[in-house]
């Protein structure tokens, strides 16, 4: 078969596995006269064998390892043995066969890492070699962790990355590795190869033994720092260090404070810089950070707990200019007249803040001195002595010493003497007849006017009056509000009236006054008042069971859903017709009778959720009355929206020619909802062409960087297609265009001739 | 550093169907588009078209429109191009090549023989 | 589709010779051409890209240039291992096409 397996001397390539015993023949050379013979050299390793009559083969099997390429040259000769055609090169390429399993470089390994390493962040590597063809699966290398010892829970503290042989810390390994509890672990590393997805693959093991060592960045106890420190400032109340010098150490106010008292130097010493005020902020609570030369972090901050410690630096303060009290002139010794209550801005429930009272001071001393008593902790007033006569003292003064530990502070306090209350009120009617009043009457209406006397002293608490009503309103919907001088009672209403539930009530009023009545007299009949109060139908709009409806669906929902109902009732039984009010985009339908919401068109969340409509139930029959609610629908996103860029990418460009290559920065987002993460979009050329020319890089989830690969650009516009694929379920791709200009600059501007200013670009890079 | 490993030779059938692979390795597989070459003696070098991985997105020749069909599985970083309908005149030899085409497979040698 | 026309078809020269190979386009393809060498075994490498941007790794006697429509690569010094094909790839616009190849021959 010419061609194939025979033919003439010429340059030829040959592929043969390693490790087959020959089978046939690699070539037949055919001579040209006057060549009659052929003779082989070059690395033929006593293997490849050229007959004279130009049979070319070998005679035992290859081995890749040992030679993966065997060079060889045939020469033609004449009958006198002299080269008439060649030496031409024939190459023998020595196909792999996985013969070789992978070893360890080491068979035991030893690492450390520390407490609370970042997860996924390598601190050691186990390397394994293959004499086979790394370009085949045969050397292509699978690393695997086989064991953990110990094993706590079941739960892997390290992994492995398959490819690479790096050994990290999991989530798991990073937050629970703890050396106090352990500390030290032993892994067991396979190796296979064959990519590890053959069973015929080959492997190895290797034991690694790692210390686990201690993480020192930790947070520091919290911190108590007395305030208004008079010592010079700043002062060192605490320190955090990293574990390896070199850290810059800074600290973040998550509070965005407008004074932050505290500062960190490169030691990782936290310094108070000014004096604190507890009554300003008594608790800061800010972080300290840890990061490399190139301003990266090196660990998650730490949170720093300072609590500033009280001083008595505050006196105590009275609640008012003057506290009035008023006091019955027959009270009776040990009566309460009123309680002081003095305040100190100095911490609750310390001796900073414990306030003591005492009298020091009555006016006048008639019929005597110490008429008074006040409680030394609970400042609350008694009557000390005989009881008071009005005609004799009205009023007396009383000064007042109120102290914490160190500070002391007068208050004043004014004591009304009053007539005893010894009058009940009296109603000037028992029975206020009968109202009657349709159920939408307003609510604030004044319905009723009713009216007592009191004969004590007037304008105090014995002589004022005070309304309750005590009978046949449990729904409170009435109320009594009174005026202070005429003591005259408005009786309002407060809720709704209702003829369904409550058609007739019958009202009891008491009267009664805010001071107590003197010992042996009671309120009798004459405080009482009745009334009955009659409520008449009208004919009422249905009532929705909730003022606002909300459902929630996904944005893809089929035309024809059930996305909600609604539900009303008439108050007089009637019979309820549903209807729809604002649904400007038409994507919902209401069944009338069940009130049940339908989606009749596709929904879309970008176009605003929640969707919000009214719903209208109206009676049917009768006066045909109706109501609102509203429905809010919120639309959960589905992935309905492609990437696209965030702004208009318009005026970017280049000054030509490029004296280097450059890059520009790009932002694109999408419609979508991105929850948490946000975006996690993914870049790459809109086709391979453009790949000669451009390169896009990912910066992160919503930016990209768009270089040249080169200088060599023509002076135009190039449009550059980029494909930004969301990642989404399902994936969207959106293929965008950024235009990038390659002009002469002028001042590190595009140059435009005259009369050639159109689109002028306006971004230089 | 990157390679294109591609399968071994075939010899097919007329009528029947095959797919070549190409596996990538030493770079982000998903970002670059791998292209797919044709090259038979006498006719030289063809584009056959392009894939992205990372999105399946694909443009092709028209000319090869219904004969090449282009995947990708990410998992195994691996380009596939089926070809259907077999004929003698695909015989050929079919390379791969990432966008920009500074790195080739060693190509995959396809014969078409009854 | 654009045509890459590509002369001459084979070129003898002797190591050491200057040599120039040309490619001409029927349509304005701006610089998006690249020069591909392939060696005898079918192993297929970049020598040039964006017409005259020389891959790394490539020796320096390999150069690209254009003029109009024709691109040029030139060999300023022949060594013994250039005496392979060569072809022209056009980027401008799809499909992507080729020259037809050049190969050059020891004299």
């Known amino acids: 078969q010419e061609g194939k397996f025979s033919g003439p001397l010429k340059p030829m390539t040959f592929s043969i596995y390693e490790g087959q015993e020959p089978s046939q023949i690699i070539f037949q050379f055919k001579a040209n006269p006057p060549a009659v013979t052929f003779e082989l050299t070059g690395e033929t390793d006593n293997i490849f064998v050229i007959e004279r009559e130009g049979l070319l083969y070998y005679n035992r099997a290859l081995d890749r390892e040992t030679r993966s390429t065997h060079n060889l040259q045939v020469a033609a000769l004449d009958a006198n043995g002299i080269i008439v055609e060649g030496p031409v090169p024939i190459t023998i390429k020595v196909k792999d066969i996985n013969d070789n399993r992978p070893t360890f470089l080491q068979s035991k390994y030893e690492g450390s890492v520390r407490q609370n390493s970042r997860p996924g962040k390598p601190f050691l590597y186990v390397n394994a070699t293959d004499l086979d063809d790394p370009a085949t699966p045969n050397g292509q290398l699978y690393y695997q962790i086989v064991i953990q010892l110990p094993m706590i829970n079941n739960v892997m503290y390290f992994q492995i990355n398959n490819k690479t042989g790096a050994i990290s810390l999991t989530r798991e390994g990073s937050q629970e590795l703890n050396p106090a509890k352990n500390p030290s672990y032993n892994l067991v590393i396979s190796v296979k190869d064959m990519g590890g997805q053959s069973e015929n693959s080959f492997s190895d093991t290797t034991s690694v033994d790692i210390i686990v060592t201690e993480n020192i960045w930790k947070a520091p106890k919290p911190v108590e720092m007395v305030e208004n420190s008079t010592d010079p400032h700043p002062i060192k109340i605490t320190q955090v260090r990293w574990n390896d010098p070199g850290a810059q150490y800074s600290l973040v106010d998550k509070e965005k404070l407008p004074r932050f008292p505290f500062s960190i130097d490169q030691e990782g010493d936290i310094y108070v810089t000014q004096p604190l005020d507890r009554e300003e902020k008594d608790a800061y609570v800010f972080y300290a950070v840890a990061k490399d030369e190139y301003g990266k972090p090196l660990s998650y901050p730490l949170e720093i707990h300072v609590k500033v410690k009280d001083i008595n630096d505050n006196p105590p303060t009275c609640p008012s200019p003057v506290t009035v009290f008023e006091v019955q002139e027959n009270e009776r010794l040990g009566n309460s007249i009123g309680t002081l209550t003095a305040h100190d801005r100095d911490e609750e429930n310390t001796a900073n803040s414990f306030l003591n009272y005492r009298i020091v001071e009555q006016t006048p001393k008639l019929p005597m001195d110490g008429l008074f008593l006040i409680q030394t902790y609970a400042g609350m007033l008694q009557l000390a002595k005989q009881s008071l006569k009005k005609q004799d003292t009205p009023q007396y003064n009383l000064t007042i010493e109120v102290s914490d530990k160190d500070f002391k502070t007068l208050c004043f306090v004014q004591i009304n003497v009053i007539d005893i209350n010894d009058q009940i009120p009296i109603f000037e009617k028992s029975d206020y007849g009968n109202l009657t009043l349709a159920e939408d009457t307003n609510i604030g209406s004044t319905i009723l006017t009713i009216q007592a006397t009191d004969a004590d002293e007037p304008f105090t608490g014995s002589s004022k009056i005070l309304y309750h009503i005590i009978k046949g309103d449990s729904e409170g919907r009435l109320g009594v509000d009174t005026d202070p001088h005429t003591n005259t009672g408005y009786v309002i209403i407060k809720k709704p009236l209702d003829f369904e539930t409550a058609a007739v009530s019958n009202i009891v009023f008491k009267a009664e006054n805010p001071e107590p009545l003197v010992f042996g007299v009671k309120y009798n009949a004459s405080s009482f008042a009745k009334f009955t109060l009659i409520v008449t139908d009208v004919n009422e709009a249905p009532q929705f069971s909730q003022h606002v409806f909300q459902a929630k669906v996904s944005e893809d929902v089929a035309i024809g859903t059930k996305v909600g109902n609604v539900t009303a009732k008439d108050p007089e039984g009637l019979d309820i017709s549903y209807s729809l009010r604002g649904d400007t985009r038409g994507w919902l339908k209401i069944d009338h009778v069940t009130g049940e919401i339908f989606s009749v068109a596709p929904l879309d969340r970008e176009a605003g959720s929640p969707y919000r409509v009214q719903v209208v139930a109206t009676e049917v029959g009768g006066s045909s009355l109706s109501s609102v609610s509203e429905f809010h629908l919120i639309l959960m996103d589905v992935n309905d929206n492609p990437p696209r860029l965030a702004k208009d990418y318009t005026g970017l460009f280049f000054c030509h020619p490029l004296s280097a290559p450059g890059s520009l920065i790009f932002e694109a987002t999408d419609d979508d909802q991105h929850l948490f993460r946000g975006p996690h979009f993914t870049f790459s050329l809109g086709s391979g062409s453009l790949q000669n020319d451009w390169e896009v890089s990912k910066i992160n989830g919503t930016h990209a960087r768009l270089s040249t690969r080169h200088t060599e650009f023509e002076e135009r516009e190039y449009v550059v297609l980029i494909r930004i694929n969301d990642g989404g379920r399902p994936p969207l791709e959106g293929i965008v265009s950024l235009p990038v200009t390659f002009c002469s600059c002028v001042e590190g501007s595009c140059f435009r001739p005259a009369g050639h200013q159109t689109g002028i670009p306006t971004v230089g890079m | 550093q990157v390679q294109l490993q591609q399968s071994g030779a075939e010899l097919m059938k007329p009528g029947a169907s095959v797919k070549l692979s190409c596996k990538a390795t030493?770079?982000?597989?998903?970002?670059?588009?791998i292209e797919w070459i044709k090259q038979r003696p006498g006719h030289g070098l063809e584009w056959i078209g392009e894939i992205l991985p990372g999105s399946g997105s694909t443009n092709y020749n028209e000319k090869f429109k219904g004969k090449a069909t282009f995947t990708a599985d990410t998992s195994s970083n691996t380009a596939y191009m089926e070809l259907s309908s077999l004929t003698t005149e695909d015989s050929a030899i079919y390379y791969c090549?990432?966008?920009?085409?500074?790195?080739w497979g060693q190509g995959t040698t396809l014969t078409v023989s009854s | 589709d654009i045509q890459m026309t590509q002369s001459p078809s084979s070129l003898s020269a002797s190591l050491g010779e200057r040599v120039s190979l040309t490619c001409r386009a029927s349509q304005d393809i701006g610089r998006s051409v690249n020069w591909l060498q392939q060696e005898p075994d079918g192993t297929i490498k970049r020598l040039i890209y964006a017409t005259s941007s020389l891959e790394s790794g490539v020796p320096k006697r390999f150069s690209g240039s254009r003029s109009g429509s024709d691109y040029f690569l030139t060999i300023s010094s022949l060594e013994s291992e250039d005496f392979v094909d060569y072809y022209c790839l056009q980027y401008a616009s799809s499909p992507l096409t080729f020259g037809a190849g050049t190969k050059l021959e020891l004299k």
């Open positions: 030493g770079y982000t597989f998903t970002g670059y588009w």
């Open positions: 090549a990432r966008a920009g085409y500074n790195n």
